[in-house]
């Protein structure tokens, strides 16, 4: 997928993109993270590159977004998966692709799924494939809550700033 | 898809739909554009019809949205593609479908992809197909930035106000 | 899809409108509904369970969301469908899957589609399938307007709080 990301030089300068606010005196926590394209078999979220950012209290800890203040947030994420045709000598097995945004909160002793998307892919001979998943919704979150993602099919991710991302903003 | 349009009588009353603002003394730039259904082999964005609008400084120039003031915006777009089965006499070739929201800014000498979704479709005999793509995310934008879209598969777009759209709003 | 938009004359006058304001600048109407998992062959929206909520004036009416005050809202919804392989003895017929958010306002004698996503699925032998659809956009809505959904393929819905939802928030 040529040209879906920034060139290295553009990426370097993109980091200095100003932290800008509309003319409101109140804080507006927001975050947009991108999947680290240098980590091919994992999904590591980054906020210090390209067009990613953390604003007004959002922070990143253990690959999770930490909710800066209690309130309602719109939370979203996208992944794009791709794959090649299977080799004629290999057996074609179905691929389960899934992406989930999860909440870890002191209220629950486990990760609660907030947003889930799923797909079964059946690779064929000579048939490269591509699949995109997006979801987002509004949730009541508490200061200190942790938002993370879980993905099935990580080796098939198309890791670029415009295809794999995760974010949230306070309403 | 029965009932997806307005009847003439409904269209007549639809004219009085208000330009409405929520109660903030500060401006809240927002825009929602729809693909012009009269242009079958291109994707032209319109804001002066149906439920589309430009509010508080957003404007449309060269098929791009112009960012009215620096700040963080949620940007989104959707396309729906459809196609018929290929003819038995024709060769079935894979179709690459893609939709991208791009940023053109004075900071970069090229269009930067912000949001990308992609799909490979393999039309089959007697098999009409439909595919939807949606994406949206928060970005730090600068006054005067241009938001545009690029689509592969334009002849296959299902152009209606509820299927093909592009918008943004300030956070 | 012929005729899915307004007539040109309607389009010309659709732009005008009075500004409206909330009575309390601090109020932020928001709603997030989830599909009731106990109702397997219908899609009933609930706000009194799991992570669903109605805030600052949103209300339910006949499985619709009632818009609490005039203004611009971001409206979104997701569904996930799944199915098993068809039996070798049965005929495989294509499945039309669709999900639509609709606006009902008495100015129209029918529901107006706001957001539509569609998919054709061709179940195969030994091939369970999964498909996700998401969409969202900003709309100018009027106090008392009713937002509802229409879904083709309800028996195939994967009803869980993270997969099937419908919401809106004021901008």
């Amino acid at each position: 997928l040529p040209g879906v990301g920034l060139t290295p030089s553009a990426a370097q300068t993109a980091r200095q993109h100003p932290k800008m606010h509309l003319a409101h005196s109140t804080l507006k926590p927001a975050a947009h993270l991108i999947g680290d394209p240098s980590k091919q078999n994992s999904l590591l979220w980054r906020a210090n590159t390209d067009r990613a950012f953390l604003q007004d209290g959002f922070s990143l800890s253990n690959n999770s977004l930490l909710v800066p203040t209690s309130g309602i947030y719109f939370v979203y994420s996208q992944v794009v998966f791709s794959g090649k045709a299977y080799s004629p000598k290999a057996t074609s097995s179905p691929l389960y692709l899934a992406h989930e945004v999860q909440l870890f909160s002191s209220q629950y002793p486990f990760h609660v799924p907030l947003l889930s998307s799923q797909k079964m892919v059946y690779p064929g001979l000579q048939e490269p494939w591509l699949h995109s998943m997006y979801h987002g919704a509004a949730f009541q979150l508490t200061q200190g809550d942790q938002l993370s993602t879980h993905t099935d099919g990580i080796p098939h991710l198309v890791l670029s700033p415009s295809t794999v991302f995760f974010g949230a903003f306070a309403l | 898809l029965p009932g997806v349009g307005l009847t003439p009588s409904a269209a007549q009353t639809a004219r009085q739909h208000p330009k409405m603002h929520l109660a903030h003394s500060t401006l809240k730039p927002a825009a929602h554009l729809i693909g012009d259904p009269s242009k079958q082999n291109s994707l032209l964005w319109r804001a002066n019809t149906d439920r589309a609008f430009l509010q508080d400084g957003f404007s449309l120039s060269n098929n791009s949205l112009l960012v009215p003031t620096s700040g963080i915006y949620f940007v989104y777009s959707q396309v729906v593609f459809s196609g018929k089965a290929y003819s038995p006499k024709a060769t079935s070739s894979p179709l690459y479908l893609a939709h991208e929201v791009q940023l053109f800014s004075s900071q970069y000498p090229f269009h930067v992809p912000l949001l990308s979704s992609q799909k490979m479709v393999y039309p089959g005999l007697q098999e009409p197909w439909l595919h939807s793509m949606y994406h949206g995310a928060a970005f730090q934008l600068t006054q005067g930035d241009q938001l545009s879209t690029h689509t592969d598969g334009i002849p296959h777009l299902v152009l209606s106000p509820s299927t093909v759209f592009f918008g943004a709003f300030a956070l | 899809l012929p005729g899915v938009g307004l007539t040109p004359s309607a389009a010309q006058t659709a732009r005008q409108h009075p500004k409206m304001h909330l009575a309390h600048s601090t109020l932020k109407p928001a709603a997030h509904l989830i599909g009731d998992p106990s109702k397997q062959n219908s899609l009933l929206w609930r706000a009194n369970t799991d992570r669903a909520f109605l805030q600052d004036g949103f209300s339910l009416s006949n499985n619709s969301l009632l818009v609490p005050t005039s203004g611009i809202y971001f409206v979104y919804s997701q569904v996930v469908f799944s199915g098993k392989a068809y039996s070798p003895k049965a005929t495989s017929s294509p499945l039309y899957l669709a999900h639509e958010v609709q606006l009902f306002s008495s100015q129209y004698p029918f529901h107006v589609p706001l957001l539509s996503s569609q998919k054709m699925v061709y179940p195969g032998l030994q091939e369970p399938w999964l498909h996700s659809m998401y969409h969202g956009a900003a709309f100018q809505l009027t106090q008392g307007d009713q937002l509802s959904t229409h879904t083709d393929g309800i028996p195939h819905l994967v009803l869980s709080p993270s997969t099937v939802f419908f919401g809106a928030f004021a901008l």
Epitope: - | T13, Q16, H17, P18 | P18, M20, H21, L22, A23, H24, L27, P29, A47, N48, T49, A52, F53, L54, Q55, D56, G57, S59, L60, S61, N62, L66, V67, P68, T69, S70, S105, S106, Q107, T142, Q143, G144, D145, Q146
Partner: antibody
């Protein structure tokens, strides 16, 4: 200052009809719906339905569907409640109300008494 | 329809007393409950919306709490002007319904 003034109440025969008016002032009439709420003597409150003067959108309590019609006249800044096939149990004070958010009855008229009796 | 049941139906109290009125919904209504005050011959007045938010101009002695099915209106220190009938209302789903009322009388 928001003001709502009801009129049109009085004595009605069983089986008869009534048309109540609600004159609104002090705000942009088309920006908010008008609700009708009734209260039988010594009893609680009962929501009848609403009309949005901007687009004539309506929503009714199923109990009153078919018997009640709520409408408005933008040129007169007035909302109306028409009720047919009246019976003794429709005897009540009828209020119009303007919300802030849709389901919050923030501003009320003084009420008008309708008595259904032969 | 969602039924709203208030208790008690009436109570006697003195100026300065702390008064609590409860309201139970027949099904969970999240936090979508409002409270109104009505004096004889007058229209109701909105006090509380969304279970716990005071409406503009309502004195701080009025507070609301609860979620799900059980809700409470509390008057922390009863004043002479507070003797009236109080109604709860669910605004979760239409038809919006009210409790039967609680009359607060002078002891």
């Amino acid at each position: 200052e928001v003001q709502l003034v009801e009129s049109g109440g009085g004595l009605v025969q069983p089986g008869g009809s009534l048309r109540l008016s609600c004159a609104a002032s002090g705000y942009t009439f088309t920006s908010y719906v008008i609700h009708w709420v009734r209260q039988a003597p010594g009893k609680g409150l009962e929501w009848v339905g609403y009309n949005n003067p901007y687009n004539d959108g309506t929503n009714y309590n199923e109990k009153f569907k078919g018997r009640a019609t709520i409408s408005s006249d933008k040129s007169k800044n007035t909302a109306y409640l028409q009720m047919n096939s009246l019976r003794a149990e429709d005897t009540a004070v009828y209020y119009c109300s303007r919300p802030t958010m849709l389901p919050w009855f923030a501003y009320w008229g003084q009420g008008t008494l309708v008595t259904v009796s032969s | 329809d969602i039924q709203m049941t208030q208790s008690p139906s009436s109570l006697s109290a003195s100026v300065g007393d702390r008064v609590t009125i409860t309201c139970r919904a027949s099904q969970a209504v999240s936090s979508a409950v409002a409270w109104y005050q009505q004096k004889p011959g007058k229209a109701p007045k909105l006090l509380i919306y969304s279970a716990s938010h005071r409406y503009t101009g309502v004195p701080s002695r009025f507070s609301g709490s609860g979620s799900g099915t059980d809700f409470t209106l509390t008057i922390s220190s009863l004043q002479p002007e507070d003797f009236a009938t109080y109604y709860c209302q669910q605004h979760y789903s239409t038809p919006w319904t009210f409790g039967q009322g609680t009359k607060v009388e002078i002891k």
